[in-house]
């Protein structure tokens, strides 16, 4: 059976809209349905209409439908404004171009290509012909308007009205033609519906074939109207959704307009000296950021690749290595040529209005105000109002409403991380946003006026399984595997969440995984009654620079005997040199005849400074990060180990503080282990576990 | 200078073991991910073995049980271990350096080195 | 297992056409593609990465799209320094997969 297409994407909506018949004559049919898109399958296929329908109305209230043989374009009909309406008018009738060969091309052009007049279809003078409109129905051979039934090469035609010339084409542009932009098409709001492909596209209020967050009540800003290419994500050109099931999205077609000019709305001021608003017109020359570290060339991919290149941002003047704001970011900005600092903004240069706008954040950002409303990773923040609900699920006081306005990035909730926004994407409901830190500014991120050092233990009774304490037991060490091998360590600090390492994961496709809990043996041998396989359903990668990674399971862990989770410390703590930590992993022994087993490597705590000194002072160590050495000579993590727990006891309670990543080599004899300090991102972690949604057992 | 440069290609007989070596300079090979991809004369690239940061490896189907990649990040160099050679494995290979730590595009390539299995 | 069909394998042209090159991935693998140019004797070069990104210094006549299954390369005016061979290559995943490039393509003078 002929799946019945869904025929609403060939109609232009008009919101609070209907059309009223000033004519009498003019007929209409209603009739009771659910959804417009019932309304637009009978108008597309005619089916119990007595006319040709060519645009309809959707009554919302009373959930009616009212079919019109005319549009807001006929004679004897005007537009009125109404809450409850919303008119459909089919776009082949208003489309002044054509698609292809223009087969389905319904317009009111009635002269050729070199000026004569059309004959009437329905008139056999002054040339007989067989094309009758009750022979082509649907092909809509109405008056002498140009129509091409047949859909023949050269575009639609008519016999024409002087006897000499029988039949001529008509000079009606390809949509494509007709259609242009400027720069990337940001700001481009024509009415191209198919990609370069020829691909109808999906409309904006739609979920199917495929579910987006583009919604247009969302992005009232962005020109989400029906179904017409649009760029909202500063991609090179435009693009749409597709009705394909099989082809998510795709670009459009549409050439760059001759002249390349811009609507004055779309130019931002220019200016050379200073920053005016987010400094998107800024054009200077300073090319190193805040700091002065230089920015790498915008048409160079090193050290850092990108796709923020002159070809993909045309008009936007990103010429040599000159801070600039292609993106819409809070202020021009570089890649840097240092790297291990991928971005940086050039916050050096003064603003032209010195209250306008802010380039950075100070401490942890929770006094932002900048105007920034993007995610790290792309996203566009949703509205901080429609969000109030789950933010109050994770604050226990009450956020300054006069700071969340719009969909700005903020940090209501003191993050340790900085600025971030809810996304609106029920995968990804928050995310961080590309904000840096201001010059100069060392504000503690971690602020504990109150207790200068934080005991990293929580105060409760070590939990106890059959009367034996679970310290002898390392049930939440996990082993991840890849392909049915191991490759990482991680951590089971929750049901359904592992902590590991951003380096553990070679491949996008989370199929290509899977977690072993309960195990002592990394083959599994002699654990097949307490081993655990679970799936992973999906990766959330830690804040910028962490190499930390949440692995969510696709169901929980159950927790027995064997598999338990760890806890975390307290955010921000300090955890005493000289304490005795242990390192946990499946990975190289440095033996020929490994035995697969869990093994153990006992380390120390050690300063930061001291850490530095170890290491030659090649290495300065920061707040995210902790640092402990061998008790044993050339003992410690290696590959096989990364992702993997450092685990400290503390009023005895076992924690894990730091997790194993890649690039500190490999247990070098006097060299202390570097890793990642876990509680500088604890609540981050907590955030997390707390904000994303687990299956449920 | 960011470069890769191969050696070790020659000939060798059928069933033969020949080691491919790849020095890296300007970066060091345990902060990417490295391949091998060889392409036989007249015939398209067809990627052979990859090695990720944290020292897992993948082989293509054709590669798997025969050849081995490995690296030793003190000499910043990458190796090709190819054992039980066929006369199908006559190609040039190339190194090429992944982007970041994981599976991805190759964003710096070798010169390559011949290798030709013949008797 | 994700294989890669590039079509068509040859295809002659002249200096100024506009070239289309198609690569299908027998399941999805989102904007994971990248493209390569090849000429004899030389190493391959990166041209296209995450579908639709221009690699640096590559000259803005091509130009990558598509997302899921198919993917396309496009020259919109061929040069003469544009005669050479092109390759796709999946980005997602190595899982069970014979080859992560396509056959290729070679753009050859009319």
């Known amino acids: 059976q002929r799946k019945r297409r869904n025929t609403i994407h060939e109609f232009k909506k008009s919101a609070k809209t209907t059309l009223i018949k000033i004519d009498p004559a003019l007929k209409i049919k209603t009739k009771k349905v659910n959804t417009a898109d019932q309304c637009a399958n009978r108008c597309t296929r005619n089916k119990g209409l007595p006319f040709t329908c060519k645009a309809f109305v959707f009554d919302k209230a009373r959930k009616q439908c009212l079919w019109f043989p005319f549009n807001s374009m006929s004679s004897g009909v005007k537009k009125e404004f109404g809450h409850e309406f919303d008119l459909y008018e089919n776009k082949d009738y208003i489309r002044n171009c054509i698609i292809g060969k223009g087969r389905s091309y319904k317009g009111t052009v009635s002269i050729t290509k070199s000026g004569i007049k059309c004959q009437p279809w329905s008139s056999m003078i002054p040339h007989e012909h067989s094309f009758l409109p009750s022979s082509y129905r649907g092909k809509d051979l109405q008056e002498n308007y140009c129509r091409n039934p047949r859909g023949e090469e050269g575009g639609p035609w008519c016999f024409t009205s002087n006897p000499e010339v029988r039949y001529e084409v008509c000079d009606i542009p390809q949509c494509s033609e007709v259609e242009c932009m400027t720069c990337n098409g940001e700001s481009y709001r024509g009415l191209m519906d198919h990609t370069e492909s020829g691909k109808i596209c999906q409309r904006w209020d739609h979920q199917t074939p495929h579910r987006h967050k583009f919604l247009p009540e969302r992005y009232p800003d962005k020109g989400f109207d029906d179904n017409y290419c649009r760029n909202p994500d500063g991609q090179p050109r435009p693009w749409c959704y597709t009705l394909d099931p099989h082809t998510r999205w795709e670009y459009c077609a549409i050439k760059t307009c001759a002249d390349n000019t811009m609507n004055d709305t779309d130019v931002p001021l220019e200016t050379t000296e200073c920053i005016q608003g987010q400094g998107e017109g800024y054009r200077g020359t300073v090319n190193t950021i805040w700091n002065g570290i230089p920015c790498q060339r915008w048409d160079s991919q090193y050290p850092h690749e990108h796709d923020m290149t002159p070809e993909n941002f045309k008009c936007k003047d990103l010429r040599e290595n000159y801070c600039r704001n292609p993106d819409g970011s809070e202020s021009p900005w570089c890649f840097t040529t240092d790297p291990n600092i991928r971005v940086g903004y050039c916050s050096q240069i003064p603003n032209c209005d010195m209250s306008h706008g802010q380039d950075c954040y100070r401490g942890n950002g929770k006094n932002y105000m900048g105007n920034l409303s993007q995610t790290r990773s792309g996203l566009t923040c949703s509205m901080w109002d429609k969000n109030m609900e789950d933010l109050h699920r994770h604050i226990f006081w009450e956020p300054d409403a006069s700071k969340l306005n719009e969909n700005y990035c903020r940090n209501p909730d003191d993050d340790a991380h900085g600025p971030w926004c809810y996304t609106g994407n029920p995968l990804i409901p928050w995310d961080y946003c590309p904000i840096s830190r201001c010059e100069g500014d060392t504000t503690p991120t971690i602020v504990n006026l109150d207790h200068p050092v934080i005991s990293c233990a929580k105060t409760k009774q070590l939990r106890v399984v059959n009367g034996i304490p679970t310290r002898t037991n390392i049930g939440w060490m996990v082993s991840l595997r890849y392909r049915n091998k191991h490759i990482c360590g991680g951590s089971l600090i929750k049901e359904s969440w592992v902590l590991t390492a951003r380096q553990c994961f070679p491949s996008r496709d989370l199929k290509d995984y899977e977690a072993w809990l309960g195990i002592h043996d990394v083959h599994g041998r002699g654990d097949e009654k307490c081993k655990q396989v679970l799936n992973v359903s999906q990766l959330v990668y830690g804040p910028e620079g962490s190499d930390l990674v949440l692995m969510k399971l696709a169901r929980p862990a159950v927790l027995d005997d064997f598999v338990s989770t760890i806890d975390l410390p307290n955010y921000g703590c300090t955890i005493p040199e000289k304490t005795s930590c242990s390192v946990y992993g499946w990975g190289y022994t440095g033996l020929i005849n490994y035995d697969g087993l869990l093994r153990v490597a006992h380390l120390y705590i050690m300063g930061n400074e001291k850490c530095s000194q170890h290491h030659r002072g090649k290495v300065t160590l920061n707040e995210s990060e902790i640092c402990a050495g061998a008790e044993k000579i050339g003992s410690g993590p290696c590959e096989g180990d990364y992702g993997g727990p450092l685990v400290c006891e503390q009023h005895k309670m076992r924690m894990v503080l730091g997790v194993i990543v890649p690039g500190r080599g490999c247990a070098i004899p006097n060299r202390p282990g570097i890793f990642v300090r876990v509680a500088y991102y604890a609540k981050w972690i907590h955030k997390i576990i707390l904000t994303y949604k687990v299956p449920q057992s | 200078e960011v470069q890769l440069v191969e050696s070790g290609g020659g000939l060798v007989q059928p069933g033969g073991s020949l080691r491919l070596s790849c020095a890296a300079s300007?970066?060091?090979?345990?902060?990417?991910?490295i391949s091998w991809v060889r392409q036989a004369p007249g015939k398209g690239l067809e990627w052979v073995a990859v090695?990720?940061?944290?020292?897992?490896?993948d082989y293509a189907s054709s590669a798997k049980g025969r050849f081995t990649i490995s690296r030793d990040n003190s000499k910043n160099t990458l190796y090709l271990q190819m054992n039980s050679l066929r006369a199908e494995d006559t190609a040039v290979y190339y190194c090429?350096?992944?982007?970041?730590?994981?599976?991805?595009?190759?964003?710096?390539w070798g010169q390559g080195t011949l290798v030709t299995v013949s008797s | 297992d994700y294989q890669m069909t590039q079509s068509p394998s040859t295809l002659s042209a002249s200096v100024g056409d506009r070239v289309t090159i198609t690569c299908q991935v027998s399941?999805?693998?989102?904007?994971?593609l990248s493209w390569y140019q090849q000429k004899p004797g030389k190493a391959p070069k990166l041209l296209i990465y995450r579908a639709s990104t221009l690699a640096s210094g590559v000259p803005s006549r091509f130009s990558g799209s598509g997302s899921g299954t198919e993917f396309t390369l496009t020259i919109s005016s061929l040069q003469p320094d544009d005669f050479a061979t092109y390759y796709c290559q999946q980005a997602y995943s190595v899982s069970n997969v014979d080859n992560a490039f396509g056959g290729g393509t070679k753009v050859e003078i009319k």
């Open positions: 090429a350096r992944v982007y970041d730590s994981g599976w991805n595009h190759f964003n710096l």
């Open positions: 090695i990720y940061v944290v020292g897992a490896t």
């Open positions: 399941q999805s693998i989102s904007s994971w």
């Open positions: 300007g970066f060091t090979v345990s902060s990417n991910a």
